[in-house]
């Protein structure tokens, strides 16, 4: 038997278990937590990954400046419901009965209510900005090579079709990735803007959620990039809906 | 679909050399670690030899240091195992590996997603 045969696992996800009783003893994986099968040959939904982590035991160049609808992914981890497909659920409950509304990358887009709260649609985020410091360089890194290296790494690593890779702005050590994508431009089988964010933000953290025990080694022209501050800002196709009393907070 | 095709097996006698090549038909080769894993007859897949994407970083078996030795030509999406003073317990199915791109890997077969099927080395007087 070959070498191929004996890493039944899963490259993009070690979220998951997996056995070859696939199709002609093909390798099959289910994420953990949910039990859905996975495709192992792109990217996880965030929905799934969220759950698969709350069931594992606890253990010019100018810069942007994120529009005022901008959502912050302030609540952090919970165990969200996903639909069939693995896609955050619009509406999302707790063990005691609180919900509110999320965007499609699980961030909450409404105030905290009760079951009676009605979430009509799963609204799009469209529009994501990751916001990077990088640790000290002796120098600046080249702009042209530091852009070609982040659309490179989300073709790649992420799988994300070059197109929805809007910009990279760099004014050292700031850096921002710009993703966009339209629910009229994401065609079947495109990896969705918000979990490349997730995978990113999780490679940045030093938790990879590839397979192996190994984590994200970028570098530009051979120069380690090693970030030391990472923001993500979301912005929805639709505004988000909070009260006055939490803007003014 | 990345595709690892090797070459360079043989039979050869114990003390002599061998090269094997691992062409790698992925565009993603240059952002990838390679690797080289043997399995000897009856025994389990070991880790050989890791080179780093940059090739400033290799790693090697305690079994074939000082004695192997890996790099790789990014312009030719190839990577090499130089193989000396070669030992009959060397005889192996040998196959190279690809990580993950932009994925760090050691010796370990699971830090590995794409593999060649293998070439035979057989090491005999």
């Known amino acids: 038997h070959t070498a191929a045969q004996d890493n039944c696992t899963c490259p993009t996800n070690k979220m998951t278990v997996c056995s070859p009783d696939g199709p002609g003893g093909r390798c099959q994986c289910r994420a953990l937590g949910s039990g859905m099968a996975v495709d192992c040959s792109t990217l996880t939904s965030k929905c799934l990954l969220l759950k698969a982590r709350m069931s594992a035991p606890k253990n010019a160049r100018t810069l942007v400046r994120p529009s005022e609808h901008a959502l912050v992914d302030n609540d952090g981890l919970y165990d969200p419901d996903c639909d069939p497909e693995g896609r955050f659920k619009a509406r999302q409950c707790n063990q005691t009965s609180v919900c509110w509304c999320v965007n499609s990358v699980g961030v909450r887009r409404t105030d905290k209510g009760d079951l009676s709260l009605r979430c009509d649609e799963l609204v799009r985020t469209h529009h994501i900005l990751i916001d990077l410091r990088h640790r000290p360089t002796a120098g600046a890194f080249n702009h042209s090579d530091l852009d070609a290296e982040l659309r490179r790494l989300f073709r790649e690593r992420y799988r994300l079709h070059p197109k929805f890779v809007a910009a990279v702005h760099y004014e050292q050590p700031t850096i921002q990735i710009e993703l966009r994508q339209n629910t009229s431009q994401k065609a079947a089988g495109d990896v969705d803007i918000g979990d490349a964010a997730y995978y990113f933000e999780r490679d940045i953290k030093g938790e990879s959620l590839f397979q192996g025990r190994g984590g994200l080694d970028l570098r530009v022209r051979g120069e380690p990039l090693q970030v030391e501050r990472t923001l993500i800002y979301y912005l929805d196709e639709i505004p988000p809906k909070f009260s006055m009393k939490r803007l003014t907070a | 679909e990345v595709q690892l095709l090797e070459s360079g097996g043989g039979l050869v006698q114990p003390g002599g050399s061998l090269r094997l090549s691992c062409v790698d038909s992925?565009?993603?080769?240059?952002?990838?670690?390679m690797g080289w894993f043997r399995r000897a007859p009856g025994k389990g897949l070991e880790g050989v030899s890791v080179?780093?994407?940059?090739?400033?970083?290799?790693y090697y078996a305690d079994s074939v240091k000082d004695r192997f030795t890996i790099s790789r030509d990014n312009a030719k999406n190839t990577v090499y195992l130089q193989m000396n003073s070669l030992k009959p317990e060397d005889t192996a199915m040998y196959y190279c590996?690809?990580?993950?791109?932009?994925?760090?890997?050691?010796?370990?077969?699971?830090?590995?997603?794409?593999w060649g099927q293998g070439t035979l080395v057989t090491v005999s007087s």
């Open positions: 080179i780093s994407p940059y090739g400033d970083s290799t």
């Open positions: 992925g565009s993603t080769y240059s952002r990838r670690y």
């Open positions: 590996a690809a990580s993950w791109p932009y994925q760090t890997a050691s010796l370990d077969a699971m830090d590995f997603t794409d």
